[in-house]
């Protein structure tokens, strides 16, 4: 299996990429050789051999071309090659090495003479594991991968250098690489391509938000000797309209939206709702759909709703208690309220005004949550239309007329307002004798009053009620010197009014009469 | 270059000995180890043995050994084959070879022309 | 001692054909053979060498593979130059050569 070279290494130099000759410089020119090969993958290669295991002393040097450093500091060389046994070769006991050596040069030219001893020793290579001839019979090579550090590296380009001593060997592949923190993208920041420091410090690189993001708090990452990005720190997120997907941040599809800078998914138009292009904020509303003004954009668009129905009138007298049943339709909405409109009108429906400031509504006119409301204080005998409106947060964004249900009424005639004062006009051991002012608003012809008394001590627990016809009344059999309190309600064919307030008076002690006396509470 | 020069044809009697020089130019004569191979008229090739030029340690193939000697004269770059108590069956062409050892095999890259030994009464 | 043999004794082609030269070990062997070729008076010449390395010089329609007792040598598309008697070699401690295959003009 071809494993893929790291994305963090940076070629600076791989034989096996070179398309013909390698042309590397072989001195003496009988020891090393370049031939043409096939590597671990049976890929046709050029590879260079030495095999001169019969002499002492060899001394067999190749360089390879000069390799410009690029912004390398520290250079990794990776040499694949394959050392023969020297038990697998006849004739040679004592001659054979088992062991190479690589060296380098830096230059700022690349027309550099070979001399030895401008070299600096890089290591001796040995192998893991020499092969004997019998691996051949099925090809198979032991290939030897060894890594070396040089570094650091300051010319603008180097020589490397493969010295034999009398070992079987061919060199495979080498490449020499440098490592970077590779191009990254992480939380939504880019951190781009970093050659790390020759010295074991970390280097700081600051990241740039991808397209369609911003900064949530300043990304930043660090950057090892080792070409690992390292520590995390800070991020971006995408803006609004836009989500994270993978490592960008992607606009909105049509039909979804996303409201806010941050880190949440695009979310579906809510109903009623749609977007036709991409990176959208929010959602538009369908035709006669509305979002009010402090709705969220994740609400939904709604409409006003339809008119209440079943609208119900009681009526007593001049009061009305009216109810209706909600709206078949909500709109799509909770906050409905229902508005009392009411006009009192003549005889003919159409001629209709508002209604005096002096009408009540219970427990309110406008914004009424509940489906009931009672209206007191109308005229009697009085037509009245009364309309309801349902509204909801959405009404006033709507041109369609108002969804209303209307219920007309009559009133009937009134009962009369209370008699205001009563007056003692005598007194006596046993009897009072009272007057008393007609109300204010009879309503109607008044057919008598009412008058209901007790003693103050006994607390109502027992009354005595009498009918006058007229605006007074003489009252016998009571005990003398005792208090009593009175009421009077006036009663017309509509019926009785609302009591007065309770006036109290004294009977006398004696047999005298005291005349003119205003009662007292 | 690099080749192999061998002398030219020898006929000799049965009983007598015969030397056969192959003389190396072109390349460090001691880096290579020589080899000699056997072809009698009209057969196929058998290999012999071979020598270290280094040192001159010789190895014997089986049947070639007794009266079979490889020698060197380092000084001159040439390997020898002297074939003693010749017999009729030892009539053949004898070639020296190069043998080139490699991390991936083995083998003879450089052939001397060859020296046909004639043994006849 | 390993026996090398070589078929067919004689292979017969005509120029620009594939030729197919087989050789079979009387024992698996520890390595590919090397293969020569000779021409009528001339020295032997090596082709190839560890499994398939191709000798200096040596055209790449040239080709070895097999492995344990049977190899094989391929001329991809025989040249009238080709026509010549081949062996196959075996190498170790001791070495020893096939009969031979001689490929002659069809």
């Known amino acids: 299996e071809l494993s893929p070279q790291p994305s963090n290494e940076v070629n600076l130099l791989d034989s096996k990429t070179i398309q013909g000759e390698l042309g590397w410089i072989s001195y003496p020119s009988h020891g090393w050789e370049e031939i043409s090969g096939v590597d671990e993958h049976y890929t046709p290669i050029r590879t260079y051999q030495v095999c001169n295991v019969m002499d002492h002393s060899q001394n067999n040097w190749l360089r390879t071309n000069w390799v410009p450093r690029n912004s390398a500091q520290k250079i990794y060389v990776e040499l694949k090659f394959t050392l023969r046994d020297c038990n697998s070769i006849p004739l040679v006991l004592g001659t054979c090495k088992e062991t190479f050596n690589l060296y380098y040069m830096e230059s700022d030219d690349h027309g550099v003479k070979f001399r030895e001893h401008q070299f600096t020793k890089i290591d001796t290579i040995a192998a893991d594991e020499s092969f004997t001839q019998m691996d051949l019979g099925d090809r198979i090579l032991k290939l030897n991968t060894e890594i070396r550090e040089v570094g650091p590296v300051n010319k603008k380009g180097f020589y490397l250098a493969f010295q034999d001593v009398g070992a079987c060997v061919a060199l495979v592949s080498v490449r020499v690489y440098f490592k970077k923190c590779p191009f990254t993208v992480k939380n939504l920041a880019m951190f781009p391509d970093t050659v790390p420091m020759d010295s074991q410090s970390l280097v700081e690189v600051r990241g740039s938000c991808v397209n369609n993001s911003k900064e949530e708090d300043p990304p930043r990452m660090y950057c090892s000797t080792e070409g690992e990005w390292l520590v995390p720190i800070g991020k971006c997120t995408c803006n609004a309209g836009y989500e994270e997907r993978g490592f960008i941040c992607q606009a909105c599809r049509p039909g979804f939206y996303k409201a806010s800078d941050g880190a949440a998914k695009c979310a579906k138009c809510p109903p009623h709702s749609s977007t036709q292009e991409d990176g959208s904020m929010n959602c538009r509303c369908e035709n006669n759909y509305f979002r009010a003004e402090k709705d969220p954009p994740s609400m939904a668009c709604a409409r006003p709703p339809s008119a209440p129905r079943n609208v119900i009138s009681n009526i007593n007298e001049t009061s009305v208690i009216l109810d209706w049943s909600w709206p078949l339709d909500t709109g799509g909405r909770k906050d409905i309220t229902f508005n009392i409109i009411c006009k009192k009108c003549g005889w003919n429906v159409r001629q209709c005004e508002p209604c005096s400031p002096n009408v009540r509504f219970l427990p309110r006119q406008l914004g009424l949550t509940n489906t009931t409301v009672t209206v007191t204080d109308l005229l009697a005998h009085t037509n009245y239309t009364f309309e309801i409106d349902a509204v909801n947060g959405v009404s006033e964004l709507s041109s369609p007329p108002r969804q209303y249900a209307a219920v007309s009424i009559t009133t009937n005639q009134a009962a009369p307002s209370p008699v205001m004062t009563i007056k003692k006009d005598r007194t006596s051991r046993n009897s009072i004798s009272l007057s008393w002012q007609e109300p204010e608003h009879p309503n109607g012809i008044i057919l008598d009053y009412e008058v209901k008394y007790y003693q103050k001590q006994e607390q109502e627990t027992s009354y005595t009620i009498l009918r006058a016809r007229g605006t007074n009344v003489t009252i016998s059999s009571l005990k003398p010197d005792t208090t009593y309190v009175f009421q009077i309600r006036a009663r017309t064919a509509a019926g009785y009014g609302t009591n007065s307030r309770k006036f109290e008076f004294e009977t006398s002690p004696d047999s005298f009469s005291i005349s003119g006396e205003n009662s007292h509470v | 270059q690099v080749q192999l020069l061998q002398s030219g044809a020898e006929v000799k009697k049965p009983g007598a000995s015969v030397k056969v020089p192959c003389k190396a130019s072109g390349y460090t004569f001691t880096s290579r180890a020589m080899s000699w191979v056997r072809q009698a008229p009209g057969q196929g090739l058998e290999w012999m043995g071979w020598i270290n030029t280094n040192t001159g340690n010789p190895t014997y193939a089986q049947g070639f050994t007794g009266r079979f000697v490889f020698s060197l004269d380092t000084s001159v770059s040439t390997a020898y084959l002297q074939i003693s108590s010749l017999k009729a069956e030892d009539t053949a062409v004898y070639y020296c070879?190069?043998?080139?050892?490699?991390?991936?095999?083995?083998?003879?890259?450089?052939w001397g022309q060859g020296t046909l030994v004639t043994v006849s009464s | 001692e390993i026996v090398l043999t070589q078929s067919p004794a004689t292979l017969s082609v005509s120029p620009g054909e594939r030729a197919t030269l087989s050789c079979r070990a009387s024992?698996?062997?520890?390595?590919?053979p090397a293969w020569y070729q000779q021409k009528p008076g001339q020295a032997p010449r090596l082709l190839i060498y560890g499994a398939s390395t191709r000798a200096t010089g040596i055209p790449d329609r040239f080709s070895a593979s097999g492995s344990g007792t049977d190899f094989t040598l391929t001329i991809s598309r025989v040249e009238p130059e080709d026509f010549a008697v081949y062996y196959c070699q075996q190498y170790g401690p001791s070495w020893t050569f096939g009969q031979g295959t001689k490929v002659e003009i069809k």
């Open positions: 024992q698996s062997v520890s390595s590919n």
């Open positions: 070879a190069r043998v080139r050892f490699t991390v991936y095999g083995d083998g003879m890259d450089v």
